[in-house]
């Protein structure tokens, strides 16, 4: 089900990032960091256990989900928030719901590649992974 | 619990430097910026500057970029603030306090350092 | 540089009354990114308010915060002693990094 997000991958392009998380309402000081940050995304499957691990030296944050159940996230940018993560057309889609706000993040498999598109309102960063 | 400490007080002459430090301890160092900022006697508060710990970038207030240097010390979650050519307007407290992220707002203060200049 | 314009900039008040405290923005800013801060004589500021509305620890529910863009305000439902003070907003949405000159609110 999840089995095509397996594996180590590194960022190699990003777009539109700070912008994005300016919608989101993240300080300067924690863009400046974040920005600079080249996460490798780390992500395995245990039955219907989910795990997404994201390591830089900015932040190492892990998440361990079951597809369509809320649970309780600290992002890398210290946001504390309620996530869900459903399948959608192939596609992992997560909605994060915190002080009245909601963003919107969709990981999905493009080639070889991963690709996150992040979104909030009306601004959206893309960000693409290859394997490590 | 979270903590930074500062020293109580400075008394330097004219023209010389100091370094005051804030040694943080009940969390992760590297995981938040320290910020600086000045409260002259009977004033506000000032931004100078913040430190990264966890990569030694710095964003410095313009006004101060050739007042302070700011440095940090991972192994014993120390930073440091450099002040030189000191004049009388230096006087002032020196607050260190920890940047908490996503909002970036000060979550915890030191007590700050009393620094005087005087001859 | 984005300014933050307080006011007033002095203020008495009597016990049980109502304060509100606004602090201005001269360009519009995330609300996520306005902060205020309880400084008293000689001790260090204290966290009061942060992200616009949520109360830090220990702060009394009879304070709030509310605002957005470029008009924010800190508002006591009913004033008590312990509450004469320095009251500053901040501002880190945009650099550099701000604070408003500060209202200091007395008893009366």
């Known amino acids: 089900m999840c089995d095509a997000f397996v594996g180590t991958w590194k960022l190699v392009s990003s777009e539109n990032f700070d912008d994005y998380m300016k919608e989101v309402g993240v300080g300067f000081a924690t863009r400046k960091v974040a920005g600079m940050a080249k996460p490798n995304m780390i992500i395995s499957v245990n039955g219907d256990l989910v795990t997404i691990r994201s390591e830089s030296t900015f932040k190492n944050t892990e998440i361990s989900f079951k597809l369509g159940v809320e649970f309780d996230e600290i992002t890398a940018d210290d946001r504390k928030v309620k996530s869900i993560i459903t399948l959608d057309g192939g596609a992992l889609v997560q909605v994060q719901k915190w002080d009245g706000k909601s963003t919107t993040i969709k990981r999905k498999r493009d080639g070889d590649k991963l690709v996150v598109e992040c979104v909030m309102k009306g601004v959206t960063s893309t960000r693409v992974y290859e394997r490590a | 619990q979270v903590q930074l400490q500062q020293p109580g007080a400075e008394l330097v002459k004219p023209g010389a430097s100091v370094k005051l430090s804030c040694k943080a301890s009940g969390y992760t160092f590297t995981s938040n910026w320290i910020t600086w900022v000045k409260q002259r006697p009977g004033q506000g508060l000032e931004w100078i500057g913040d430190i990264y710990p966890g990569s030694g970038s710095t964003t410095n207030n313009e006004k101060f970029k050739s007042k302070a240097t700011l440095t940090v010390d991972t192994s014993s979650s120390t930073a440091y603030m450099q002040l030189s050519s000191l004049t009388s307007e230096d006087s002032a407290v020196y607050y260190c306090?920890?940047?908490?992220?996503?909002?970036?707002?000060?979550?915890?203060w030191g007590q700050g350092t009393t620094l005087t200049v005087s001859s | 540089e984005v300014v933050l314009t307080q006011s007033p900039a002095l203020m008495a008040a009597s016990p049980g009354e109502k304060v509100t405290i606004t602090c201005s923005v001269s360009?519009?800013?995330?609300?996520?990114?306005l902060h205020w801060y309880q400084q008293k004589s000689e001790t260090s500021p204290k966290p009061w308010i942060y992200g616009t509305s949520n109360l830090a620890s220990g702060v009394p529910v009879r304070f709030s915060g509310s605002g957005s863009g470029t008009s924010y305000s800190l508002t006591i439902s009913s004033m008590e002693a312990e509450d004469a003070a320095t009251y500053y907003c901040?501002?880190?949405?945009?650099?550099?990094?701000?604070f408003g000159a500060g209202t200091k609110l007395e008893l009366k």
């Open positions: 306090a920890r940047l908490r992220g996503y909002y970036d707002y000060f979550d915890f």
């Open positions: 901040q501002q880190w949405s945009h650099y550099p990094l701000t």
């Open positions: 360009s519009s800013i995330s609300s996520s990114n």
